[in-house]
């Protein structure tokens, strides 16, 4: 994976989400869960601090179906 000490912001973040999520597409925020009243967005999680592949993949959209 990428160097974990580095953060991903702007175009770097969009590039990486596009490559990792591929056909699934991606979101910049996830729905709030019962555990957390406020969902942290990917900018907060990956731009303000470093994030790994597993975290990035949680922002991939649910797989779509073929036409």
């Amino acid at each position: 994976a990428y160097r974990p000490s580095e953060t991903l912001c702007g175009g770097e973040l969009v590039d990486t989400l596009q490559f990792v999520c591929g056909d699934r597409g991606f979101y910049f925020s996830r729905p709030a869960s019962r555990v957390s009243r406020r969902s942290r967005g990917i900018v907060e999680e990956c731009c303000f601090r470093s994030c790994d592949l597993a975290l990035l993949e949680t922002y991939c959209a649910t797989p779509a179906k073929s036409e």
Epitope: A1, Y2, R3, E6, T7, L8, G11, E12, D15, T16, Q18, F19, V20, C21, G22, D23, R24, L53, E57, P63, A64, K65, S66, E67
Partner: antibody
Framework: EVQLVESGGGVVQPGRSLRLSCAAS????????MTWVRQAPGKGLEWVAY????????YYRDSVKGRFTISRDNSKNTLYLQMNSLRAEDTAVYYC???????????WGQGTLVTVSS | DIVMTQSPDSLAVSLGERATINCRAS?????MHWYQQKPGQPPKLLIY???KLASGVPDRFSGSGSGTDFTLTISSLQAEDVAVYYC?????????FGQGTKVEIK
């Protein structure tokens, strides 16, 4: 028109190193993430490495992690693949590629052949 | 990783006849993408999003399928279609290709 031209391939002994280059033209190189894909002789296609447009994010297939390093110089419109500790199974044609969303691996260079042999 | 399995490995078809290539994914994928590779050339994007023709691709090529099973069809084989065809999935990281299907003229 997108043009990608690879160079740097050749015959190398196991354990040695090689650096591949890919010169890009016909598009705004610094706006695009890039990848390397390889093809062993008579075999299928295998994604090798990814680098984001600014170079801050890189990913590798498991078999090359720790041995290969992808990098780029946006001022020279050039992509690189530094290959260390080469193995016989790394023998392949190496292609540099880029994508538009949904048009995955849409643009390819002609490839450069790397042969790892003693 | 999702494993892509193409069948058959090779097929020989008479000029003007139909050629059908199958691609099966080890897990469900959103879409399938197909590439054509002629001898000594890099692969070329042929079909994206399961069924959409890439620019300049003749309409004798078509793609279909969903879930884990997808098909590339050449409705009337032409001499210039002799090539190896690969499927690709981009629904799961990392991207994975099928092993290829060689199409020849009978």
């Amino acid at each position: 028109e997108v043009q990608l031209v690879e160079s740097g391939g050749g015959v190398v002994q196991p354990g040695r190193s090689l650096r591949l280059s890919c010169a890009a033209s016909g598009f705004t190189f610094s706006n695009y993430y890039m990848t390397w894909v390889r093809q062993a002789p008579g075999k299928g296609l295998e994604w090798v490495a990814y680098i984001s447009s600014g170079g801050g994010s890189t990913y590798y297939r498991d078999s090359v992690k720790g041995r290969f390093t992808i990098s780029r110089d946006n001022s020279k419109n050039t992509l690189y693949l530094q290959m260390n500790s080469l193995r016989a199974e790394d023998t392949a044609v190496y292609y540099c590629t880029t994508e538009d969303y949904g048009y995955w691996f849409a643009y390819w260079g002609q490839g450069t052949l790397v042969t790892v042999s003693s | 990783d999702i494993v892509m399995t193409q069948s058959p490995d090779s097929l020989a078809v008479s000029l003007g006849e139909r050629a059908t290539i199958n691609c099966r994914a080890s897990s469900s994928v959103s879409y399938m993408h197909w590439y054509q590779q002629k001898p000594g050339q890099p692969p070329k994007l042929l079909i994206y999003g399961t069924s959409k023709l890439a620019s300049g691709v003749p309409d004798r090529f078509s793609g279909s399928g969903s879930g884990t099973d997808f098909t590339l069809t050449i409705s009337s084989l032409q001499a210039e279609d002799v090539a190896v065809y690969y499927c690709l999935q981009r629904s799961s990281y990392p991207p994975t290709f099928g092993q290829g299907t060689k199409v020849e003229i009978k």
